[in-house]
């Protein structure tokens, strides 16, 4: 099931997926002056079985100089419902994230691809936020958002990362200092937290993700 909305926008922060759930689509976008090859794939699709996941289809771009247009390729109408845009970055998957069963790694770049990637995320997808350069997180640890299905509707949990100005860039998971805790709310020392938001507290009574008060139960 595709997620109905984009991941939340957090002031002075960007998000990135560390691994992509099966069913995720990545539009085959080309940079200005190039177009998708004739009969080329519209998108790459993360598919797989119980032991291995990979991207089906390959994106290919060719020069559009011979055609009377430099228009950038956009998704077909049926694809335009979900446009998840992330800036192109070098893959930063921690091993435990990228090797998750049922997940694909960041697809390698293709020649003349667009500067931004447009993903169509599925329920269960997790993205991580970091403060942009010049800003620093008030709290320590990764800020996450997960696409969930609730009452028949999809929604992204709210990370509420607070990035304050004139500070150095914070880090993505995998580059964290040891013992990092989720962004935003004080977390119980005995609990395991998947998604967090500022203004939330998890108490020590919360021993599992499903019984986490404030955080998991109400997102």
């Amino acid at each position: 099931e595709l997620c109905d909305d984009d991941p939340p926008e957090i002031p002075h922060a960007t998000f990135k997926a560390m691994a992509y759930k099966e069913g995720t689509m990545l539009n085959c976008e080309c940079k200005r002056g190039f177009r998708r090859i004739k009969s080329g794939s519209l998108y790459m699709l993360c598919t797989g079985n119980s032991s291995h996941s990979s991207w089906d289809n390959q994106c290919q771009c060719t020069s559009s100089a011979t055609r009377n247009t430099t228009k950038q390729v956009t998704p077909q109408p049926e694809e335009q419902k979900e446009r998840k845009t992330t800036e192109m970055q070098s893959p930063m998957q921690p091993v435990d994230q990228a090797s998750l069963p049922g997940h694909c790694r960041e697809p390698p770049p293709w020649e003349n691809e667009a500067t931004e990637r447009i993903y169509h995320f599925v329920v269960g997808q997790m993205v991580y936020y970091q403060c942009v350069q010049g800003y620093r997180a008030l709290h320590r640890g990764p800020a996450e958002s997960v696409c969930k299905m609730t009452h028949g509707k999809t929604r992204w949990t709210q990370p509420q990362l607070i990035c304050t100005g004139e500070m150095e860039t914070s880090q993505f998971p995998g580059e964290e200092k040891p013992q990092a805790s989720p962004e935003g709310r004080p977390e119980s020392e005995t609990s395991c937290l998947v998604t967090t938001t500022d203004f939330q507290i998890q108490t020590e009574m919360a021993a599992t993700m499903e019984t986490s008060i404030f955080t998991t139960e109400y997102q």
Partner: antibody
């Protein structure tokens, strides 16, 4: 259970000093930004100061800048507020708050009067 | 003067629905920061009532709901009860202050 317990309040003369403490338990104190928020008698909430999880940066409300200093000792799970050059208008209940902020202590009363 | 603007008072009879507004600016609510609501009963510390615009912490009845649009937000209380009589504050991070800002508070009276 998450707990924040303030102490150090009391009666002080104008121009005097006080140091408030906030003992935290029940969560990973060293991972979260902490705040001081105050409430004058019969008035609303006013944010005073914030300190980042590692103490590397601090911000203050204009009304206390240059007079108050926020600090923390992560090894003791304790937040502090050093208040100097106190004025009558600083009279309030001072709350320690965790997050941005969601969980609050019960507060400690600071009275500045001659 | 508070950075976020709330009506000083609101009232309703038991069972009624009451709405409290909160207006901010481009440096707080309008900048994309979430709005949070607190309930403060007489003589007690503020308690988180709504977080991230419309989420309820565990134990908060679904009679309480929140919403946000542009530079404003609102708290709605349906099925008003006598125990809802309290002061209500909105809050949001403000990037010009690098700290949270609060509304002046709304005193809710249940008639």
């Amino acid at each position: 259970e998450v707990q924040l317990l303030e102490s150090g309040g009391g009666l002080v003369q104008p121009g005097g000093s006080l140091r408030l403490s906030c003992a935290a338990s029940g969560f990973t104190f060293s991972s979260y930004g902490m705040h001081w928020v105050r409430q004058a008698p019969g008035k609303g909430l006013e944010w005073v100061s914030v300190i980042s999880y590692d103490g590397s940066y601090k911000y203050y409300a204009d009304s206390v800048k240059g007079r108050f200093t926020i600090s923390r000792d992560n090894s003791k799970n304790t937040l502090y507020l050093q208040m100097n050059s106190l004025r009558a208008e600083d009279t309030a209940v001072y709350y320690c708050a965790a997050g941005v902020p969601d969980y609050w202590g019960q507060g400690t009363l600071v009275t500045v009067s001659s | 003067q508070s950075v976020l603007t709330q009506p000083p008072s609101a009232s309703g009879t038991p069972g009624q629905r009451v709405t409290i507004s909160c207006t901010g600016s481009s440096s707080n609510i309008g900048a994309g920061y979430d709005v949070h609501w607190y309930q403060q009963l007489p003589g007690t510390a503020p308690k988180l009532l709504i977080y991230s615009n419309n989420e309820r912490p565990s134990g908060v009845p679904d009679r309480f709901s929140g919403s946000k649009s542009g530079t404003s937000a609102s708290l709605a209380i349906s099925g008003l009860r006598s125990e809802d009589e309290a002061d209500y504050y909105c809050a949001a991070w403000d990037e010009s202050l690098n700290g949270p800002v609060f509304g002046g508070g709304t005193k809710l009276t249940v008639l």
